[in-house]
């Protein structure tokens, strides 16, 4: 009788990270008479992932009845597989032996690679804002994947971005792989409205890749620009003073009024209408009473954006017999403005 | 270690009927096969059955059905032969002996023996 | 049922010396034959399975052979201490049936 041949045919097996492996196994011989054992690993740090006689293996399942005299086949399923189940996997036929079974014979292994999908891409941002003109990273992870084999791209609006490195780690053999990316976008005055991408495709996710995304709604500070005018007069004393505080993002904005350096009046911006863009406007007004001036005023709108240094714009108010139209105000933006006279 | 302990000898009137046991320690009770055989004084040994405690099947040489009845208690890891109507030719040592298989017959581990005397 | 035949009640030898059992089965069974030492006031103790297999690592001056209907239980050098009775047993088909047994003597 020829001596018996344990047989593993499959040299390597792909399995999805929930599903079940089956590794299969047979043996050419009922003799010697003797359990089958499996292993992942050889050699004397090898773990044993099922005992056909010892034990308890509950993820572990038998194709058939080891228990039926004329069974050769030794294949087993391994039921919900993570990539820590990754590795080679030897069916090994032991023989009845004292005080132990003896090692008789083993199959050549069975490679079993996990197929895990990466997670969601988290992106993030600086974690201050910045202001037009400037650069600013983003990063992109991804855990958790295998295969190593995964691409990662970068988008701005729709556009691909090429100024990103990008990292796969570790760099040797793992049971599952992360991904860190970091991108270098160009803040413009237009990307209140802007996102960014980060785009992970994967063998497991099937042609349907993953995305993360940031706003730059986010990371993007607009500074507002600021006009001072001065509206028709209203009354015989009375000078109406406009200050137009324009395309300024994020929406958070202190007004100071200040007539020759005193404060008169504190506002935040509350009624604000928004632009296409994104970016917000606002106006305040101040009401002048010229009739208690007997000198010229210096009038100054002094805005505090989004926690920055204050910047600001002042107008000299003429006080004379009779005030003249000292510009006009062509925009509607006036909603929530506060009337205040001076006295 | 692997241990099959038996229970005593046992004395026995003519057609009573006797019940032994085997206590199995060291190893899984349910993944193994409990054989019974049979030795006359100063003769050669008889395969009687077996039990296989994981499903309970049972297997009898024809010349013992009716006589020996084996059964077994996972709880305890025991298993038992019950003999009955006995008579002097019962008179014998039986062992308990353990297989890796029902199809295996080739006996690994046997245990002390159990003496029955059958007498009046 | 199939017989098994030790065709020797007892075998005579001395210590040192080489010592073969024969046992025949009465229709092929492979190579499924086990073999036995039983001591006086004892239990029998496996020695070879599948006609071969040596089911203690120690000693190894026993070993067994044989395929089909006729089989060879070997001491390569006999000790004092294998004194026994040695049986022959099929474990190809039940009921699984043993030799009469060969009591090995030491001269």
């Known amino acids: 009788e020829e001596e018996l041949q344990v047989i593993q045919p499959d040299k390597s097996v792909l399995v999805a990270a929930g599903e079940t492996a089956t590794l299969r196994c047979t043996a050419t011989s009922l003799i010697p008479v003797g359990p089958i054992q499996w292993f992942r690993g050889a050699g004397p740090g090898r773990e044993l992932i099922y005992n056909q006689k010892e034990g308890h293996f509950p993820r572990v399942t038998t194709v058939s009845d080891l228990t039926k005299r004329n069974n050769m086949d030794f294949s087993i399923r391994i039921g919900n597989i993570t990539p820590a189940d990754a590795g080679t996997y030897y069916c090994v036929k032991f023989r009845k032996g004292s005080p132990d079974d003896v090692e008789f014979k083993s199959g050549a292994g069975t490679e079993l690679s996990v197929r895990a999908k990466p997670s969601a891409p988290v992106v993030s941002g600086p974690a201050a804002r910045a202001t037009p003109q400037h650069t600013v990273s983003f990063t992109c992870e991804s855990h958790g994947f295998s295969p190593r084999d995964i691409t990662l791209k970068w988008f701005k609006n729709g556009n691909e971005l090429s100024d990103f490195q990008t990292n796969v780690d570790p760099v040797g053999e793992s049971v599952s792989y992360s991904i860190h990316s970091t991108a270098k976008v160009v803040l413009t005055r237009e990307d209140v409205h802007s996102q960014v991408i980060c785009e992970v495709a994967h063998v497991t996710l099937q042609g349907d890749p993953l995305r993360g995304t940031a706003n730059l709604s986010e990371t993007i500070r607009v500074p507002p620009t600021l006009e001072v005018t001065q509206q028709p007069v209203r009354a015989e004393n009375q000078v109406n003073v406009t200050c137009q505080v324009r395309k300024f993002y994020p929406q958070r904005l202190q007004l100071t009024w200040l007539e020759n350096g005193n404060v008169s009046r504190t506002e935040t911006a509350s009624t604000v209408t928004e632009n296409k863009d994104g970016t917000y406007n606002w106006m305040s007004w101040l009401l002048v009473n010229v009739s208690a001036h007997r000198d010229d005023v210096k009038l100054t709108c002094q805005v505090e954006h989004d926690g920055q240094p204050a910047v600001s714009k002042s107008h000299d108010l003429k006080v004379s017999a009779h005030p003249k139209e000292q510009g006009s105000n062509t925009a509607a933006e006036n909603t929530g403005s506060n009337e205040r006279n001076i006295y | 270690e692997v241990q099959l302990q038996q229970s005593g000898p046992e004395l026995v009137k003519p057609g009573a009927s006797v019940k032994m046991s085997c206590k199995a320690s060291?190893?899984?009770?349910?993944?193994?096969?409990m054989h019974w055989v049979k030795q006359k004084p100063g003769q050669g040994l008889e395969w009687i059955g077996y039990i296989n405690p994981y499903n309970d099947g049972t297997k009898y040489n024809e010349k013992f059905k009716g006589k020996a009845t084996l059964t077994s208690d996972k709880s305890s890891s025991t298993a038992y032969m019950e003999l009955s109507s006995l008579t002097s030719e019962d008179s014998a040592v039986y062992y308990c002996?353990?297989?890796?298989?029902?199809?295996?017959?080739?006996?690994?581990?046997w245990g002390q023996g159990t003496t029955l005397t059958v007498s009046s | 049922d199939i017989v098994m035949t030790q065709s020797h009640k007892f075998m005579s030898t001395s210590v040192g010396d080489r010592v073969s059992i024969t046992c025949k089965a009465s229709q092929d069974v492979t190579t499924a034959v086990a073999w036995y030492q039983q001591k006086s006031g004892q239990s029998p103790k496996l020695l070879i399975y599948?006609?071969?297999y040596r089911y203690t690592g120690d000693p190894d001056r026993f070993t067994g052979s044989g395929s089909g209907t006729d089989f060879t239980f070997t001491i390569s050098s006999v000790q004092a201490e294998d004194l026994a009775v040695y049986y022959c047993q099929q474990h190809y088909s039940t009921p699984w049936t043993f030799g009469g047994g060969t009591k090995l003597e030491i001269k």
């Open positions: 002996a353990r297989s890796y298989y029902d199809y295996d017959g080739s006996f690994d581990y």
């Open positions: 599948s006609a071969s």
């Open positions: 060291g190893y899984t009770f349910t993944s193994y096969v």
